[in-house]
């Protein structure tokens, strides 16, 4: 159970006075408060937010909140000069524009500063040529198109909706395709829920609206201009040429009204299969080109935003630990929205502020948490995890040294059907005890725990009677700290039913449609799913900020280290001859993974016997438990990526939404039979095994009895 | 406490030049810019431009491009107007003005007390 | 140029009197409007941004308000020290302009 030394409330009623104080009218107030104006990054509204809660963090009882700078790179479009695409006849007339803006919704109509939908950091440009439609723009959409149906994409304009893997993938994919535009648009199958209405009178995607959204590969690297270092007011920035990350060519996304005009008119291939197909009446033709009548026309993008080295700042909330105020638990999560940011980022935003106030009142009665919790409000995430990126730059060697724990809070809700998780393996046992101890919001498990409807609903795939908990990808603040730092991390929020709703994210995401009505009328009414969610951010930065002895099992990772071992593996004997050849074994993996898992399992015995009056010793055995993450930690990082370091888990290299398990192991295997050096690929393999194993091994032994 | 200072009152020949400095205190120099505006006698406010001390951007009146020149000093946070080949027309009180360096911007909040410049032969 | 025209150019009334000044754009700002308070030998000050966000010390009485391309600046209950002259500003784009000002006096 919780304890702390420094407390004048009894340590049992520590984090059930820290829960009961936890309000869902607060969350409800706090979200319509951040949620009337538009917050991008950059723009004087969002300081005035930085402002307002670094104010409100103090009056709640923070010991010391401070605003953090930096000069990063951001992309706006042109106010004068708007982003649009065309169809232009044989005469270059435009006889179909996009339109320029999305209509606002009902009560928005005279709010100024609303974005127009864009791709930020796309380049300028003015291209025009034949449409090619890629379906989902991911490899294996690539290679179909190449490799299968022999279609060219090369000096082709692309289509693709959104959806499945992030964004930026596409555009990546698409430019080693050889395209030289990208258009996305959201298909009604990806972002209509069918049975439900479109926004306002339900929580579907207009055919006006647009998600907006970075096309950024940054790899872990933040600000393009000053990967590794933080971009503060002396910094060394490169030229735009060296830039880490950007994009080469123009991309625009659109809505399917529009998306509707560009694809009736597609000619050339039948799509492959029915997967090709979306929700609208068109054919899903893949081109390249029009259609017969339409032959003569092509399509042409007008893209003029500009890059622009521009001030953030994240909002650092410190309440110092009574016993260890040298370790820190950091609740982070952020601030920038794309326009009204209903559900991202503010439900997660309004969570934060809610457990800030819950802490803060316990504070004001005398009580201090054992270690010390920060809590962030980050800015230009939306721009590529800026804010964050940079101050974990600037501050990484406190946090290398000092960090415990980053639980994650962007958006609190997705959907309403069940939890969400992902994190650690460290966490697994955290996150189960927690869950026990609270109620399930969800009707039909009234008087059940949480931990029993999150069973029902999404149950593990492999271990009955427990949850699934999924692994950390990318795409949101706990990247830095998790996959360079080494920093165990979490997330969690409610989500969708994902077997039912087959569409990706919700569907109004990064539109100007995410407002707070959406939430207060559609996804949670009395804020009952926000406030579990904020129970259980809340509740695990409470424990890991509060126990004695922190709340890690070493063992679930042992468990998952053997999982990963026996996928990759297999992945790799769907090669039998050539791992024959190049003589490629993964014994010294499995050898590791073994002993990693009798080295643990003698730690947890040490755990449970040692003295833990003894402070010296306490804090040993908690410094192994915290630099366990630390140790998956390879300091040249990823093949050409280096700043994804964690050798267990990186985004995956077509997704960045996605986590992979022993990734550079995965990429050395991914394609390797269209590999024009077999040999060279296979050492690569054989490289990424040795790799691997030896940071399992040098893991392992960090648990080892000291002496 | 935000401050912006100007400096004391100018008579000038036409034909002279006239530099106006806004000391500014009490917030980061470099987070905000500074617009300069003027008031002819008994007339209404006319923005003549800005700067960012931040980027080192310029934003100018057409009505002024070629004669105005807006520079600032970051280590002494101060902002400076110079304005050229002075006509008559050119006496009025001239103001310096914080406004945040972003994309979206609510124009100026702190206004300094204002320098009269008259030009007179 | 976007043009303000701000009326009444003056106006009497007295202290309790309800207030109205009223400018209006020649063409769409949205909402980047501000209103400005100016009294002798002293710096203007910014009362309202965003046609209607109250900027901090500024008193409740005052207020702001849109109506298509009109915007208004409304004192409840005039007091004493408002008897000043009052300007509109549009940022919404370069350059910015102002309304011709409306000066408030005792009746």
């Known amino acids: 159970k919780s304890s702390n030394e420094a407390t004048n409330i009894t340590p049992k009623h520590n984090m059930k006075a820290f829960l009961d104080e936890l309000k869902a009218e607060n969350i409800k107030k706090f979200l319509y408060n951040f949620t009337q104006i538009p917050h991008l990054a950059g723009t004087e509204q969002n300081f005035q937010l930085a402002k307002q809660i670094q104010s409100q963090w103090k009056e709640f009882g923070l010991d010391s909140v401070e605003l953090a700078h930096y000069d990063v790179l951001l992309s706006y479009p042109n106010k004068t000069h708007p982003n649009y695409i065309s169809i232009i006849n044989e005469d270059g007339n435009e006889i179909f524009n996009t339109s320029l803006f999305e209509p606002p919704p009902p009560g928005y109509e005279n709010v100024s500063d609303i974005v127009p939908p864009f791709s930020a950091f796309s380049p300028q440009g003015m291209p025009e040529g034949d449409l090619v439609y890629v379906n989902y723009a991911r490899t294996e959409d690539f290679f179909k198109l190449e490799r299968d149906m022999k279609i060219n994409c090369s000096g082709k304009i692309v289509i693709a909706r959104y959806g499945k893997v992030f964004r930026g993938n596409k555009v990546k994919n698409a430019q080693l395709a050889g395209a030289k535009g990208v258009i996305l648009y959201s298909d009604p199958a990806d972002y209509f829920a069918p049975g439900v209405k479109s926004y306002p009178d339900g929580w579907n995607l207009p055919g006006g609206g647009v998600q907006r959204g970075n096309i950024l590969n940054l790899n872990g690297a933040g600000d393009p201009l000053t990967p590794g270092y933080p971009a503060n007011e002396y910094a060394y920035r490169r030229g735009i040429a060296e830039a880490v990350g950007l994009p080469s060519i123009p991309v625009h996304p659109i809505g399917y009204y529009d998306a509707q005009k560009l694809l009736e008119k597609m000619g050339g291939s039948a799509p492959p299969d029915s997967s090709w197909r979306g929700s609208l009446k068109v054919p899903y033709n893949v081109g390249p080109g029009f259609t017969g009548n339409f032959s003569t026309q092509k399509v042409k993008m007008h893209i003029h935003s500009t890059n622009e080295v521009t001030r953030i700042y994240n909002v650092i909330g410190t309440l110092r630990g009574a016993v260890e105020p040298d370790r820190y638990v950091i609740l982070g999560g952020h601030r920038d929205s794309w326009v009204f940011g209903g559900i991202d980022p503010q439900s997660g935003a309004a969570v934060v502020h809610e457990i800030v106030r819950s802490f803060g009142t316990l504070k004001k009665e005398g009580w201090r948490p054992r270690r010390t919790i920060l809590f962030a409000s980050w800015d230009a995430e939306e721009f590529g995890l800026l804010g964050s990126t940079e101050w974990a730059e600037e501050n990484s060697r406190l946090l290398q040294e000092r960090g415990v724990a980053y639980i994650n809070a962007d958006s609190s809700i997705e959907g309403n059907y069940t939890l969400r998780v992902d994190c650690t393996p460290l966490m697994y046992s955290l996150v189960h005890n927690l869950t026990k101890e609270l109620k399930s919001p969800d009707e039909g498990f009234e008087g059940k725990s949480l931990y029993e409807s999150w069973t029902k609903k999404s149950p593990s795939p492999e271990f009955s009677g427990m949850p699934r908990i999924s692994k950390l990808g990318s795409g949101n603040d706990f990247e830095v700290f998790f996959q360079r730092l080494g920093i165990a991390s979490g997330r969690a929020r409610y989500t969708k039913n994902w077997e039912t709703n087959k569409f990706s994210g919700y569907p109004l995401y990064h539109s100007v449609y995410e407002t707070y009505e959406l939430v207060e009328k559609f996804y949670d009414p009395m804020f009952k799913y926000h406030l579990t969610v904020a129970q259980v951010r809340g509740g695990m930065v409470f424990e890991l900020a509060n126990s004695i002895v922190l709340p890690f099992d070493c063992r679930d990772y042992a468990v998952v280290l053997r999982k990963y071992a026996d996928k990759i593996y297999s992945i790799s004997m769907k090669h039998p001859q050539e791992m024959k050849t190049y003589s490629v074994s993964f014994d010294s993996l499995f050898s590791a993974v073994k002993n990693f898992t009798e080295i643990a399992s003698k730690f947890s015995e040490r755990l449970q016997d040692f003295d833990k009056s003894n402070p010296i010793v306490l804090r040993m055995m908690n410094d192994q438990l915290m630099f366990l993450e630390r140790a998956f930690i390879d300091p040249l990082g990823l093949p050409d990526r280096p700043f994804y370091r964690h050798v267990i888990y990186a985004p995956s290299s077509h997704n960045k939404y996605a986590g992979e398990s022993f990734p550079g192991i995965y990429d050395a295997l991914f394609d390797i039979e269209s590999k024009v050096d077999p040999s060279k690929a296979w050492g690569e393999v054989k490289r990424q095994i040795y790799v691997a194993a030896f940071t399992v091994q040098a893991a392992a032994e960090t648990l080892s009895e000291v002496a | 406490e935000v401050q912006l200072v100007q400096s004391g009152a100018e008579v000038k020949k036409p034909g002279a030049s006239v530099k106006v400095s806004c000391k500014a205190s009490g917030y980061t120099f470099t987070s905000y810019g500074i617009s300069w505006v003027r008031q002819a006698p008994g007339q209404g406010l006319e923005w003549m431009g800005e700067i960012f001390p931040r980027r080192g951007n310029t934003y100018y009146n057409e009505k002024f491009r070629g004669r105005v020149t807006m520079t600032t000093d970051k280590s002494t946070s101060t902002a400076y107007m110079e304005l050229r080949s002075l006509r008559s027309d050119d006496t009025a009180v001239y103001y310096c003005a914080r406004v945040f360096d972003g994309y979206y911007n609510y124009a100026m909040d702190y206004w300094g007390q204002g320098t009269t410049v008259t030009v007179s032969s | 140029d976007i043009q303000m025209t701000q009326s009444p150019s003056s106006l009497s009334a007295s202290v309790g009197d309800r207030v109205t000044i009223t400018c209006r754009a020649s063409q769409d700002i949205g909402s980047s409007l501000n209103w400005l308070q100016q009294k002798p030998g002293k710096a203007i000050k910014r009362l309202i941004y965003?046609?209607?966000s109250l900027d901090s010390g500024v008193p409740s009485r005052f207020s702001g308000s849109r109506s298509g391309t009109d915007y208004t600046l409304t004192i409840s209950s005039l007091q004493p020290e408002d008897f000043a002259t009052y300007y509109c500003?549009?940022?919404?784009?370069?350059?910015?302009?102002f309304g011709g000002g409306t000066k408030v006096e005792i009746k």
């Open positions: 500003l549009q940022y919404a784009s370069s350059p910015y302009t």
């Open positions: 965003a046609t209607s």
